[in-house]
């Protein structure tokens, strides 16, 4: 069956060194346990996190995300997942794309992360 993928409409803000959560869901909501779910970064499609065959596929991750991501799957039965990124870096700023693939049918949603420096009163530079 067909569905849409919905991500946050506004940029998500994070502080360097902190963790951030990027939510993503399908509509209409349905069980996505058997689907392939992932996040990549345009324009070069570097894999941030990939979930396939009921497992996280760590081997496919870009090295800069290895050990820093976690897919929160508590609500995957309703088609809702959240990507948690730990120890946010300045280079995490920018676009992310979330996708759900059900057999040959795939839809995706773009989202944006803004990274801010908590250490300065006014971000320098």
């Amino acid at each position: 069956g067909q569905f849409r993928v919905i991500g946050p409409r506004h940029p998500i803000r994070a502080l360097v060194g902190d963790e951030v959560e990027l939510p993503c869901r399908i509509s209409p909501g349905k069980n996505a346990t058997g689907m392939e779910v992932g996040w990549y970064r345009p324009p070069f499609s570097r894999v941030v996190h990939l979930y396939r065959n009921g497992k996280d596929q760590d081997g496919d991750q870009a090295p800069e995300y290895r050990g820093r991501t976690e897919l929160l799957k508590d609500a995957i039965g309703e088609g809702k997942v959240t990507l948690r990124i730990r120890n946010v870096r300045f280079s995490d700023e920018g676009g992310f794309t979330c996708f759900f693939r059900d057999h040959s049918y795939q839809e995706e949603a773009a989202m944006e992360l803004k990274v801010e420096d908590p250490f300065y009163w006014v971000s320098p530079g």
Partner: antibody, heavy 117, light 107 residues
């Protein structure tokens, strides 16, 4: 004139404590994140800790986590590093540093800490 | 943590030579890289930030380039005052990490 001046270094026995200070002048101290960086004799530079402009946020290198505490007093324009449970490998010149480009363009002259029995 | 690998560890050169120091990050850091110069008994001095921006007062013979994981510091014509140790540092993430340094010695 923009300046950072460290003090408080000296010789201390392993397991003991020491507190370093860094006095700032010539810039708006309370707007800047402040860092400690150290350099063991004949070795390279090692980042130690950072504290946010208002003191609410702190990060540490794994090598000092749980033993060192960074703090600041914006009313006194002073940065501190409380060093507990000191080890021989903590022997180094300790620099305070900051900057307005995220890189460190302001450094103190350093204070030497020697941990020896 | 992001590891910074600097090469060479020592470089022997003459006044007037063109000198290149390389720094490689273990993971992408975009352009969040600085270069410092340090002389014996002195604090480090910032030369370059954001991979290629020259800090104020730094002579134009110093230049930086690179992005992602590969970075270069170049001294176009080595001067007597340039014999020192040079460090790269990433400030993309915490902990901030430095390269091990490159000592530029007189031939």
């Amino acid at each position: 004139q923009v300046q950072l001046q460290e003090s408080g270094g000296g010789v201390v026995q392993p397991g003991r404590s020491l507190r370093l200070s860094c006095a700032a002048s010539g810039f708006t101290f309370s707007s800047y994140g402040m860092h400690w960086v150290r350099q063991a004799p004949g070795k390279g530079l090692e980042w130690v800790a950072v504290i946010s402009y208002d003191g609410s946020k702190k990060y540490y290198a794994d090598s000092v986590k749980g033993r060192f505490t960074i703090s600041r007093d914006n009313a006194k324009n002073t940065l501190y590093l409380q060093m507990n449970s000191l080890r021989a490998e903590d022997t180094a010149v300790y620099y305070c540093a900051t900057g307005n480009s995220h890189a460190f363009d302001i450094w103190g002259q350093g204070t030497m800490v020697t941990v020896s029995s | 943590d992001i590891q910074m690998t600097q090469s060479p560890s020592t470089l022997t050169a003459s006044v007037g030579d063109r000198v290149t120091v390389t720094c490689r990050a273990s993971q992408t850091i975009n352009r969040w890289l600085a270069w410092y110069q340090q002389k014996p008994g002195k604090a480090p001095k910032l030369l370059i930030y954001l991979a290629s921006s020259l800090d104020s007062g730094v002579p134009s013979r110093f230049s930086g380039s690179g992005s992602g994981t590969e970075f270069t510091l170049t001294i176009s014509s080595l001067q007597p005052d340039d014999f020192a140790t040079y460090y790269c540092q990433q400030y993309n993430a915490y902990p901030r990490t430095f390269g091990r340094g490159t000592k530029v010695e007189i031939k």
